[in-house]
Amino acid sequence: FERTRSLQDPCSNCPAGTFCDNNRNQICSPCPPNSFSSAGGQRTCDICRQCKGVFRTRKECSSTSNAECDCTPGFHCLGAGCSMCEQDCKQGQELTKKGCKDCCFGTFNDQKRGICRPWTNCSLDGKSVLVNGTKERDVVCGPSPADLSPGASSVTPPAPAREPGHSPQ
């Protein structure tokens, strides 16, 4: 095959949005419909991603950039570039192979995605449970039990307001 060869690859002159066509003496041809090249010097164009089914189009494909997908309502993205859509669950649930299941006692999930996580063990930090956990919320830890000695209160109540002209009983 005859071709005059320069030291520089002639394909390097082809900009994004085109491809360097081997079959036409390495001329720069526009990417065909439904394809793109995001960098210069490519010998072919990449096929545009199609956002079908549970995916929906967040950004249309152009000759220089791929389409971007997100997920239809009731689903959320997983993986790089939203490669998968996973079903949402309610707070207090996690997604299993059999669908959304309530969190087991002692665990919680405060989001529509992800797994149920164990409540915080307050005693590991020497603290006590101030507010009990639920399926949707973690426990709230308070001061350590030692701080709550008899006669001591975790929250100091405000002093009663005195009325003018009255001395204390």
Epitope: F1, N22, N23, P32, R43, T44, C45, D46
Partner: antibody
């Protein structure tokens, strides 16, 4: 479905010419390159050249460029490969192949192949 | 022209074996590497294009990998119908060139 149907076997004398046809169906004929690849007995595959049916643009391997001519007839979706000045070493099975989708990742692959045409050159 | 060198030139393996065929290009071919299967009846089919993309209808036991100058075709579990000769082909630069082929036989 894509089909490439080639003409029948040929026996030729040295110095003669042979013209092999390849009729395409099942896709848009003018939008895909057609390649010709040959295989001598007991040997590997050898690319001879290609043609773009839309405008008859051709590429020929240096080895064949003085003896090969590729043409097309869009009315019948047929591509022809003519090889002249035949010699015994041109005895081979000749395949036409369709290239992948224009400009896309499979563009430089040959995604469908004809059944092959045996050409025998013998005195 | 770009030279394509396949190895081995022939191999014998048992049904269920994992089989690997390699192809080396004389220069970088930027992943424009395709694999073909030629059956004993001389019919030829595309298996893999652009290094690793499976052509439609090709069983998933076939896979491809590689980059630069070195490429591999793998059959994860050899089947009796895989008896054939396998060819690599570069599509990076005209003229398109093929490896010399690897003849695969069943033990």
């Amino acid at each position: 479905q894509v089909q490439l149907v080639q003409s029948g076997a040929e026996v030729k004398k040295p110095g003669a010419s042979v013209k092999v046809s390849c009729k395409a169906s099942g896709y848009t004929f003018t939008s895909y390159w057609i390649n010709w690849v040959r295989q001598a007995p007991g040997q590997g595959l050898e690319w001879m050249g290609n043609i773009y049916p839309s405008d008859s643009y051709t590429n020929y391997d240096q080895k064949f460029k003085d003896r090969v001519t590729m043409t097309r007839d869009t009315s019948t979706s047929t591509v022809y490969m003519e090889l002249s000045s035949l010699r015994s070493e041109d005895t081979a099975v000749y395949y036409c192949t369709k290239s992948g989708e224009y400009g896309k990742i499979g563009y430089y692959a040959m995604d469908y192949w004809g059944q092959g045409t045996t050409v025998t050159v013998s005195s | 022209d770009i030279q394509m060198t396949q190895s081995p030139s022939s191999l014998s393996a048992s049904v269920g074996d994992r089989v690997t065929i390699t192809c080396r290009a004389s220069q970088d071919i930027s992943n424009y590497l395709n694999w073909y299967q030629q059956k004993p009846d001389k019919t030829v089919k595309l298996l893999i294009y652009y290094t690793s993309r499976l052509h439609s209808g090709v069983p998933s036991r076939f896979s491809g990998s590689g980059s630069g100058t070195d490429y591999t075709l793998t059959i994860s579990s050899l089947q009796p119908e895989d008896i054939a000769t396998y060819y690599c082909q570069q599509g990076n630069t005209l003229p398109y060139t093929f490896g010399q082929g690897t003849k695969l036989e069943i033990k």
